[in-house]
Amino acid sequence: QNASRGRRQRRMHPNVSQGCQGGCATCSDYNGCLSCKPRLFFALERIGMKQIGVCLSSCPSGYYGTRYPDINKCTKCKADCDTCFNKNFCTKCKSGFYLHLGKCLDNCPEGLEANNHTMECVSIVHCEVSEWNPWSPCTKKGKTCGFKRGTETRVREIIQHPSAKGNLCPPTNETRKCTVQRKKCQKGERGKKGRERKRKKPNKGESKEAIPDSKSLESSKEIPEQRENKQQQKKRKVQDKQKSVSVSTVH
């Protein structure tokens, strides 16, 4: 009822502001708003086959507001742009396009990659790692004494994780063989007693070649190593220093 009264009023006064709805300053029954109240933006809205004028406090998606002396109007952003400051600077692209320097592109330029989360072209970020930390002490089963061969490890940190097209990170862990310090273990540092270290018999159905557990591995290695004379030990130590086995953790 109210709507029809409003419509009738507009028909009687086609260009008088009292008969207009919303922020219209002047209007017509057929075209809707013809001009807007101060600070409001004029936009054309398509309804079926005709366009009617509307007055808005801010322009709809895909349009931006421009203030001229005679009219504040909503102007269309470029076809591939969803929101923009003006024709030159898009701030959000339509689906399937990537934002780069205020423009919308279907593919990012050379040297840049598409961020599918922000839908922007971004610089390719390569992995960056710190310098290696010092080697850890040479240990064998957590002990730093005895004449056994052990391992030492060093690590480095990832300072910058790579982006999708960036170079992968190099290994961040490195392990190499070494010879544990030439000092006798103190009483508390000694390993388990010999009989506890004896090789277990394989379970039924278990292959004789099954990898021995670390305890049996230790006992089996101990015997020949203990038999070595001083000369051989020295030789082995030099060889071990030269041999550096890397265990890589790739990110």
Epitope: T66, R67, Y68, P69, D70, F85, N86, K87, N88, F89
Partner: antibody, heavy 116, light 107 residues
Framework: EVQLVESGGGVVQPGRSLRLSCAAS????????MAWVRQAPGKGLEWVAT????????YYRDSVKGRFTISRDNSKNTLYLQMNSLRAEDTAVYYC?????????WGQGTMVTVSS | DIQLTQSPSSLSASVGDRVTITCRAS??????LAWYQQKPGKSPKLLIY???SLIHGVPSRFSGSGSGTDFTLTISSLQPEDFATYFC?????????FGQGTKLEIK
């Protein structure tokens, strides 16, 4: 790459006329509102006139209304400023620029000196 | 017409300094404010629009703030290439007007 190149500046006597041109390239000229902005020697920037993309509406600062006319030829990608009845206070570097709220792209400017 | 008043008119600073330039409007211009940089003999270059939106390619040491009538341009750590004249501009109302400029010089 957007390029705006002004020409037509020079030394002219008060009361005489001058026509400035601005050749545009690297963008769709007919999509953009264009403007002239001037800068007197050692002074600030002053908007002079704007013409909307299709040439149907023009706007001027009060001090040049009735003396200056801004126009464009979209088929030639060229903007013009016809300056009549020139005064000493019109002496400035005249820049053409795209005008879409802000002045995003500028030419290198052309110097106009009004002196007897 | 809306008047824009910049302060200071000129400013001496050193590389690495933090610098602030202010722009005051004679009436409310909401967030319709831009900043330009101009080097001697060159045309102005747009840096910031809508008070604080940086143009692509402008270093992040430049930032803008404010609303209504009071606005600031801040350069967090001056670089040699930043010594220039800076202008504010309002586009809330015709005629679009500029501040008188702030000349940033090397101390």
């Amino acid at each position: 790459e957007v390029q705006l190149v002004e020409s037509g500046g020079g030394v002219v006597q008060p009361g005489r006329s001058l026509r400035l041109s601005c050749a545009a390239s690297g963008f769709t000229f007919s999509d953009y509102d264009m403007a002239w902005v001037r800068q007197a020697p050692g002074k600030g920037l002053e908007w002079v006139a704007t013409i909307i993309y299709d040439g149907s509406r023009t706007y001027y600062r009060d001090s040049v209304k009735g003396r200056f006319t801004i126009s464009r030829d979209n088929s030639k990608n060229t903007l013009y400023l016809q300056m009549n009845s020139l005064r000493a206070e019109d002496t400035a570097v005249y820049y053409c620029a795209t005008h879409d709220k802000t002045f995003d792209y500028w030419g290198q400017g052309t110097m106009v000196t009004v002196s007897s | 017409d809306i008047q824009l008043t910049q302060s200071p008119s000129s400013l001496s600073a050193s590389v690495g300094d933090r610098v602030t330039i202010t722009c005051r409007a004679s009436e409310d211009i909401y967030s319709d404010l831009a900043w330009y940089q101009q080097k001697p003999g060159k045309s102005p270059k747009l840096l910031i629009y809508d008070v604080n939106s940086l143009i692509h390619g402008v270093p992040s040491r430049f930032s803008g703030s404010g609303s209504g009538t009071d606005f600031t341009l801040t350069i967090s750590s001056l670089q040699p290439e930043d010594f220039a004249t800076y202008f504010c501009q309002q586009y809330d109302n015709y005629p679009n007007t500029f501040g008188q400029g702030t000349k940033l010089e090397i101390k």
